[in-house]
């Protein structure tokens, strides 16, 4: 596999990983797929100082964080343990509301105007940011 | 200067399989990601799969999904399409590009020239 | 999936005259759009980006607008060169759909 030794050009870097932020919107999954086709993910919040330089850089704005419950419980994107690690929600959150008249509950995490998180529907067009860690082997798949 | 370079297209019959491979020249082939595109004879043009630079993360449209498998390896530059249970409706001009993330999503630019698959008994 | 309409499906034109192609997405795709040029035989060529920013190389003539849904691929004097078939495409989320195609001939 190959390593990841500095941040791609545009990409900002902090504590050995590697952030882009958006400035447009996009929904929850298009967001995420873009992330990945650029071998990254959405962000995964895992202490407050990560969400302190994540909040500095987004500003006051709706922005997608690699946290859903799409499938049952809430998940990260990268697998990082969502019950034992980190949260920042907004006071009575996540609540799963359905009055949005939009069809479903709130299944996608984001940060709102203060950093602090809150759930809503997936589809929304929000702004993103994409994380991938350095010194991380690729692990590039043996071709078939 | 980029150049890509498409081979392995030519006459197979339904059912079969065949390997298209896109060689790639005059950039950092590992740091982008590449794509398939395709056009029927005297028709329009279909996305048909895309692979991350690293090529852990693939995406593919539905009507080649589980029959197309998109790989690349990077040691020697070089991008593949690997098609299985081959239908008529998969006769076309294959195209590879490299995908350019540029402000929030990825554009196809440049394009190879080409590389014609017939499926046909 | 998101569907590409194009309009006109072809126009016949005179070099110097003002062209212009409309793209419709069936949603909201917000300014997510590629124009690409493909002449008989060859590979596509992307011309705008991001629904209105100019690739490298492509001359000025070209121009992109429009967001959400409605777009526009305007050349303002049609040259001897542009007599081509030209195609939108969204990249908002996959399939990356392509429009069916808008053919510019000669009048």
């Known amino acids: 596999g190959s390593e990841r030794t500095c941040c791609p050009v545009n990409w900002v870097e902090h504590e050995r990983s590697c952030y882009w932020f958006s400035r447009s919107g996009k929904a929850w999954a298009d967001a995420d797929n873009y992330c990945r086709l650029e071998d990254a993910h959405l962000v995964v919040v895992t202490s407050w100082e990560e969400q302190k330089f994540v909040q500095h850089h987004i500003g006051p704005v709706n922005t997608w964080m690699g946290l859903h419950d799409q499938n049952g419980p809430w998940k990260w994107v990268d697998g990082t343990d969502y019950e034992t690690g980190f949260k920042n929600w907004r006071p009575e959150q996540p609540d799963d509301w359905y009055g949005h008249g939009l069809g479903g509950g709130e299944d996608c995490a984001h940060f709102t105007d203060d950093g602090r998180w809150n759930d809503d529907v997936c589809q929304r067009p929000y702004r993103w940011v994409c994380e991938t860690e350095l010194d991380k082997a690729s692990q590039e798949p043996p071709l078939l | 200067e980029v150049q890509l370079l498409e081979s392995g297209g030519g006459l197979v019959q339904p059912g079969g399989s065949l390997r298209l491979s896109c060689a790639a020249s005059g950039f950092t082939f590992r740091t982008y990601a590449m794509t398939w595109v395709r056009q029927a004879p005297g028709k329009g043009l279909e996305w048909v799969s895309a692979i991350s630079g690293s090529g852990v993360n693939s995406f593919y449209a539905d009507s080649v999904k589980g029959r197309f498998t998109i790989s690349r390896d990077n040691s020697e530059n070089t991008l593949y399409l690997q098609m299985n249970s081959l239908r008529a409706e998969d006769t076309a001009v294959y195209y590879c590009?490299?995908?350019?993330?540029?402000?929030?999503?990825?554009?196809?630019?440049?394009w190879g020239q080409g590389t014609l698959v017939t499926v046909s008994s | 999936d998101i569907q590409m309409t194009q309009s006109p499906s072809s126009v016949s034109a005179s070099v110097g005259d003002r062209v212009t192609i409309t793209c419709r997405a069936s949603q909201d795709i917000s300014s997510w759009l590629a124009w690409f040029q493909q002449k008989p035989g060859k590979a596509p060529k992307l011309l705008i980006y991001?629904?209105?920013s100019l690739q490298n190389g492509v001359p000025s003539r070209f121009s992109g607008s429009g967001s959400g849904t409605d777009f526009t691929l305007t050349i303002s004097s049609l040259q001897p060169e542009d007599f081509a078939t030209y195609y939108c495409q969204q990249t908002n989320s996959f399939p990356f759909t392509f429009g069916p195609g808008t053919k510019v001939d000669i009048k």
């Open positions: 991001a629904a209105s």
């Open positions: 590009a490299k995908a350019r993330a540029v402000a929030g999503s990825h554009w196809f630019d440049p």
